[in-house]
C-alpha cells in the first residue's frame, strides 16, 4: 500500500488551531515538477457534505512530502469530508477523513467501519441532542432510509446493512428531519472486495494474518498497519509518537500523538494513534489495553507488562505477542519484513535464527509463495546465532508474495513471513524527444513514459550514426535533466535510444524504441564583402559583393541581404537563393531613407558572419508626373511635345526628362533632358521619317519623379534617314542626354 497518512488535529476548542496534514513516505512524493512524482493534493470534498461557504482554506507545503490545510474560522468549516491524494501512476491513492461536529444532534459511535464483502455492517448514531422527529439516513448524499424517532435503541439509531458489497462503500449520514446537515452523524463505510482473510482478483489468495489491528488489502494482500505499527504483518511496534510504514514520521507537538486522528489508505480508514482513544483521541488507554483506539488487549503472560503503545514487554527469557514463548524455543532474528528484487535476478537471501539447542544449517528452510522449499547452500555459525544463506533460482513475477523462513529444532519451531516484491525493470514506451539541434550537437529530453516499475535510478542514452554498425556511444544522465550529445558529425542522422534502470542488481531495463535525430548543416564560415552599390531610382538599389577565395567546395545555399532602417526601426530581408550570385537588385525601398546594408552567406538554417555594413542614402521621391502630354508631328524628322506642369509640387522643378523609343523597337530608350523647367513644350528633332515613336516624360526636383502617360506619334514621310533625335525647346538647341 502507498505510505500516505492524513492527520487531523482534533483539539477543537479553537477551530483556528485546527489543521489537517497529509504526509507521504513515498520516494519522490509531492515534488510535482518532475515526471516521477505527482504532487500531494489535500482538499475539502464538498460533493457529499455541503457546508456554508467560508473564507478559502490555506494550503502550505512543508518540504516535498507534506502538505497542511489551515484557515478554519468556525466549527462548521470543519464538518465534512477531507481527502488527500498521493502516490504516482497506478499507485495513486486517496485517503479520506470524515469530521463530525462535536455539537451535532447525532454522533457516530464509530466513524470508520471496515467490513468484508458479504458481511453485515451496522452503523450506530448516538443521540446527543434529542428531537422527536424522524431520522433520515443518506448514502453518498442520496436518500437511503428513514427511521421513526421511536425506533431508537438505548439512545441510538441503528442502520443495518446486510450482505454488503463493494459498491455499498461511501459516506453515510444520519440526520433528524428538517435539521441542519451540520447536525448529522457522518460515517465512512469501507467494504473490502473479498471475504474475510482473502485477497486477489478472484479472492483466491490468503491474507498474511495482519496483527495489531492491521487490515489486509484486497488488491495486493499487504497489511495496512495501524499508526504506530510496522512490518509485513504489523508485528512490530514503533517507538511512542512515531508512525508511517517504517515508523519514519514523528507526531508533532510535545504531547506526541494525543488529539490526532490518523487516516490511512483503504481498507484501513481512520483511528486514533497507538495508545489513544475517544472521539477526540485525547484519552489514554485503560490498563491492559493498547494500540490504535486502544482496541487491543495485552493478556501478557510470564510476568510481561502491558505498554499502551506496543503491547506486552517481556521479561528476559521470554518473547512472543503475549510473552508466551520461551527463549529456548528457536527464534528467527532480524528478518526484514519486505525485500525487493528485480525480475530474472538470482538473489541471495539470508535468514538468521537463535535458540537452545542451537539451530544448524539443515534446520532452517525457506518457503516460496507457491510452496517450493529451498534449502540453504551455506550457513555461518556465530556464538549467538546461525545465519543460513539461500541461493534463489531466477525470479519470475509469480514469486512476488509472502515468503517464509522457518526454523525447527527439538526445542520447538518459529517462522517469519516476509514480503518479496519482484519488480519489473523499466522499459521506455516512447523514444526520447529532440529539443534543439546544431551541426555538432543534439539536445535531447530523456524523460519518457515507461512500463515496469520505478523509481528510475539512472537513464542511459545510446546513440550512433544511422545505418552504422559501429558500437553505440552511451551517456549516463540525471533522470530529470536534458542531455546534450556533443562532438557529432554535421548533417548526419543519429539513432538515439533510452535505457532506464531501477535500483538493485538486474535493474537495467530493455532499450526503448529508437528515434532518428539529424544534426544540422555545418555553419557557413565565409564572410562576404560588399563591393559596391548604386541607386537605380528613388526606391531601387543594386548591390554587388564578393567572397574570399578558399580551396574546396563552397559551403552555402545562398545569401541573405539585410537592410536596416534605423529611423523606423524596420529590417528588410532579401533572400538570394543561388550561392553563385554576386549581385542583386533591391526594389520597393523607401525613398529618402538612410539604410544600413550587409550580406551573409547561409547554409540550411544557419547564417554565416555578416559583411562589414555599408550605409546607403536613397534619394527622396520626385515630383508627380507632368499632365496632359501631347505629341504632334511637324515634319518627317520633328515631333513637338506639349504638356502641363505637375500639380502639388514639393519644390521648384530643376529639369524634365523625355524618354523616346521607336514603337515596337528592341533597343534601349533614349533620355533627353529639358533643362528649362518653366517651358511646357519642346521639339524633338533628328527623327526618322515615317516612323512611329513612343514618348513619356517626368520632372526632377531632387530626385526623378513619376512618369507621365505614354503618347504615340509618327513622323511625316519621304524624308532622309536622320542621325538621331535631338530636342529643341522653343528656339534653343540642346544636346542629347542618354
Amino acid at each position: 500500500a502507498v505510505d500516505l497518512t492524513l492527520l487531523a488535529n482534533l483539539r477543537l476548542t479553537d477551530p483556528q488551531r485546527f489543521f489537517l496534514t497529509c504526509v507521504s513516505g513515498e520516494a519522490g512524493a509531492g515534488r510535482g515538477s518532475d515526471a516521477w512524482g505527482p504532487p500531494l493534493l489535500l482538499e475539502k470534498d464538498d460533493r457529499i457534505v455541503r457546508t456554508p461557504p467560508g473564507p478559502p482554506l490555506r494550503l502550505a507545503r512543508n518540504g516535498s512530502h507534506q502538505v497542511t490545510l489551515r484557515g478554519f474560522s468556525k466549527p462548521s468549516d470543519l464538518v465534512g469530508v477531507f481527502s488527500c491524494v498521493g502516490g504516482a501512476g497506478a499507485r495513486r491513492t486517496r485517503v479520506i477523513y470524515v469530521h463530525n461536529s462535536p455539537g451535532a444532534h447525532l454522533l457516530p459511535d464509530k466513524v470508520t467501519h471496515t467490513v468484508n464483502k458479504g458481511d453485515t455492517a451496522v452503523l450506530s448514531a448516538r443521540v446527543h441532542k434529542e428531537k422527536q422527529t424522524d431520522v433520515i439516513w443518506k448514502s453518498n448524499g442520496s436518500y437511503f432510509y428513514t427511521l421513526d424517532w421511536h425506533e431508537a435503541q438505548d439512545g441510538r439509531f441503528l442502520l443495518q446493512l446486510p450482505n454488503v458489497q463493494p459498491p455499498s462503500s461511501g459516506i453515510y449520514s444520519a440526520t433528524y428531519l428538517e435539521a441542519s446537515p451540520l447536525g448529522s452523524a457522518f460515517f465512512r463505510l469501507i467494504v473490502r472486495g473479498c471475504g474475510a482473510g482473502r485477497w486477489g482478483p478472484g479472492c483466491t489468495k490468503e491474507c498474511p494474518g495482519c496483527l495489531h489491528g492491521g487490515v489486509c488489502h484486497d488488491h495486493d494482500g499487504e497489511c495496512v498497519c495501524p499508526p504506530g505499527f510496522t512490518g509485513t504483518r504489523c508485528e512490530q511496534a514503533c517507538r511512542e509518537g512515531r508512525f508511517g510504514q517504517s515508523c519514519q514520521e514523528q507526531c508533532p507537538g510535545i504531547s506526541g500523538c494525543r488529539g490526532l486522528t490518523f487516516c490511512l489508505p483503504d481498507p484501513y480508514g481512520c483511528s486514533c494513534g497507538s495508545g489513544w482513544r475517544g472521539s477526540q483521541c485525547q484519552e489514554a488507554c485503560a490498563p491492559g489495553h493498547f494500540g490504535a483506539d486502544c482496541r487491543l488487549q495485552c493478556q501478557c503472560q510470564n510476568g510481561g507488562t502491558c505498554d499502551r503503545f506496543s503491547g506486552c514487554v517481556c521479561p528476559s527469557g521470554w518473547h512472543g505477542v503475549h510473552c508466551e514463548k520461551s527463549d529456548r524455543i528457536p527464534q528467527i532474528l532480524n528478518m526484514a519484513s519486505e525485500l525487493e528484487f528485480n525480475l530474472e535476478t538470482m538473489p541471495r537471501i539470508n535468514c538468521a535464527a537463535a535458540g537452545n539447542p542451537f539451530p544448524v544449517r539443515g534446520s532452517i528452510e525457506l518457503r516460496k509463495p507457491d510452496g517450493t522449499v529451498l534449502l540453504s547452500t551455506k550457513a555461518i555459525v556465530e556464538p549467538e546465532k546461525t545465519t543460513a544463506e539461500f541461493e534463489v533460482p531466477r525470479l519470475v513475477l509469480a514469486d512476488s508474495g509472502f515468503w517464509e523462513c522457518r526454523v525447527s529444532t527439538s526445542g520447538g519451531q518459529d517462522s517469519r513471513r516476509f514480503k518479496v516484491n519482484v519488480k519489473v525493470p523499466p522499459v521506455p514506451l516512447a523514444a526520447p524527444r529532440l529539443l534543439t539541434k546544431q551541426s555538432r550537437q543534439l539536445v535531447v529530453s530523456p524523460l519518457v513514459s515507461f512500463s515496469g516499475d520505478g523509481p528510475i535510478s539512472t537513464v542511459r542514452l545510446h546513440y550512433r550514426p544511422q545505418d552504422s554498425t559501429m558500437d553505440w556511444s552511451t551517456i549516463v544522465v540525471d533522470p530529470s535533466e536534458n542531455v546534450t550529445l556533443m562532438n557529432l558529425r554535421p548533417k548526419t542522422g543519429y539513432s538515439v535510444r533510452v535505457q532506464l534502470s531501477r535500483p538493485g542488481e538486474g535493474g537495467e531495463g530493455a532499450w526503448g524504441p529508437p528515434t532518428l535525430m539529424t544534426t544540422d548543416c555545418p555553419e557557413p564560415l565565409l564572410q562576404p564583402w560588399l563591393e559596391g552599390w548604386h541607386v537605380e531610382g528613388t526606391d531601387r538599389l543594386r548591390v554587388s559583393w564578393s567572397l574570399p577565395l578558399v580551396p574546396g567546395p563552397l559551403v552555402g545555399d545562398g545569401f541573405l541581404l539585410r537592410l536596416w532602417d534605423g529611423t523606423r526601426g524596420q529590417e528588410r530581408r532579401e533572400n538570394v537563393s543561388s550561392p553563385q550570385a554576386r549581385t542583386a537588385l533591391l526594389t520597393g525601398l523607401t525613398p529618402g531613407t538612410h539604410y544600413q546594408l550587409d550580406v551573409q552567406l547561409y547554409h540550411c538554417t544557419l547564417l554565416g558572419p555578416a559583411s562589414p555594413p555599408a550605409h546607403v542614402l536613397l534619394p527622396p521621391s520626385g515630383p508627380p508626373a507632368p499632365r496632359h502630354l501631347h505629341a504632334q508631328a511637324l515634319s518627317d524628322s520633328e515631333i513637338q511635345l506639349t504638356w502641363k506642369h505637375p500639380e502639388a509640387l514639393p519644390g521648384p522643378i530643376s529639369k524634365y526628362v523625355v524618354e523616346v523609343q521607336v514603337a515596337g523597337g528592341a533597343g534601349d530608350p533614349l533620355w533627353i533632358d529639358v533643362d528649362r523647367p518653366e517651358e511646357t513644350s519642346t521639339i524633338i528633332r533628328g527623327l526618322n521619317a515615317s516612323t512611329r515613336y513612343l514618348f513619356r516624360m517626368r520632372a526632377s526636383i531632387q530626385g526623378l519623379g513619376d512618369w507621365s502617360n505614354t503618347v504615340e506619334e509618327s513622323t511625316l514621310g519621304n524624308g532622309l534617314q536622320a542621325e538621331g533625335p535631338v530636342q529643341e525647346s522653343r528656339a534653343a538647341e540642346e544636346g542629347l542626354d542618354q
Epitope: 455541503r50 422527536q132 422527529t133 424522524d134 433520515i136 443518506k138 448524499g141 442520496s142 436518500y143 437511503f144 432510509y145 428513514t146 427511521l147 421513526d148 421511536h150 425506533e151 440526520t175 433528524y176 428531519l177 428538517e178 435539521a179 441542519s180 446537515p181 448529522s184
Partner: antibody, heavy 123, light 106 residues
C-alpha cells in the same frame, strides 16, 4: 422507472371492508416510507396513513384511526391498506405515494404517486 | 395539528403572473412543497423545499417562503398551467395539505 400501481377499490356498503394494494417497482421499496393519501370527489388531498421502511411503525389520521390498518410486504414490494367499518365519508380516490429526501436537505416531499383507486361507500 | 390556508380559486390571463398564497402559523420555519393536479390525474410535485424545482418543471414556476406565507409564482402563465395547486408541509412527519387553489387561465 419508478411505478406505483393501486388496486382493490370498488363499491362497498357502509360498515363493509376493503383491502387496497399498491405494487411498487423500479426502486428499493424496503428503504422508503410509504403513504396513503385520499381525495374525496371535488375536494382536496387528505393524508390517511404512513408506514416506515421496516414496517414496525405506523401512523393514522384521526378520521381513520382504529378502522384502517396500513402494512407492507417488502419481499413482494407491496403496500396495503385494510379498511374496515367503512363510512360514506370514506368515499374517495385513494393514492399510494412515496416520499424521499433531496440532496442537500433533510426534508421529505412526495416524489411519486400512483394513479389512484376509487373507493365508493354507499348503500 | 397545523392548518394551511389557500384561496379556493385564482384567474389570470395568459402571459400574466399568477401568485398562489399558502398561509399558516410560522410557516417560514418549515419547508413547503407544492403539487399540481390536473383534472383526472394524480398530483405532481412542482416545487419542494420552498423553491427547488424537480427536473422537467419549467423555470416559469418559482417559490418563496417567509413569515406566515409561502407563495407559488407562475410567470408568463400558459393554458397548460390550468390545474389545482396544493401546498404541503410536515408536522412531525405527518403530511399537512392546504385546501387547494384552482388556477383558471382565461
Amino acid at each position: 422507472e419508478v411505478q406505483l400501481l393501486e388496486s382493490g377499490g370498488g363499491l362497498v356498503q357502509p360498515g363493509g371492508s376493503l383491502r387496497l394494494s399498491c405494487a411498487a417497482s423500479g426502486f428499493t421499496f424496503s428503504s422508503y416510507m410509504m403513504f396513503w393519501v385520499r381525495q374525496a370527489p371535488g375536494k382536496g388531498l387528505e393524508w390517511v396513513s404512513r408506514i416506515y421502511p421496516s414496517g414496525g411503525w405506523t401512523y393514522y389520521a384521526d378520521s381513520v384511526k382504529g378502522r384502517f390498518t396500513i402494512s407492507r410486504d417488502n419481499s413482494k414490494n407491496t403496500l396495503y391498506l385494510q379498511m374496515n367499518s367503512l363510512r360514506a365519508e370514506d368515499t374517495a380516490v385513494y393514492y399510494c405515494a412515496r416520499v424521499t429526501v433531496p440532496l442537500d436537505s433533510g426534508s421529505y416531499y412526495f416524489d411519486y404517486w400512483g394513479q389512484g383507486t376509487l373507493v365508493t361507500v354507499s348503500s | 395539528q397545523s392548518v394551511l390556508t389557500q384561496p379556493p380559486s385564482l384567474s389570470v390571463s395568459p402571459g400574466q403572473t399568477a401568485r398562489i398564497a399558502c398561509s399558516g402559523d410560522n410557516l417560514g420555519s418549515r419547508y413547503i412543497s407544492w403539487y399540481q393536479q390536473k383534472s383526472g390525474q394524480s398530483p405532481v410535485v412542482v416545487l419542494y423545499q420552498d423553491y427547488r424545482r424537480p427536473s422537467g418543471i419549467p423555470e416559469r414556476i418559482s417559490g418563496s417562503n417567509s413569515g406566515n406565507t409561502a407563495t407559488l409564482t407562475i410567470s408568463g402563465t400558459q393554458a397548460v398551467d390550468e390545474a389545482d395547486y396544493y401546498c404541503q408541509a410536515w408536522d412531525r412527519s405527518t403530511a399537512v395539505f392546504g385546501g387547494g387553489t384552482r388556477l383558471t387561465v382565461l
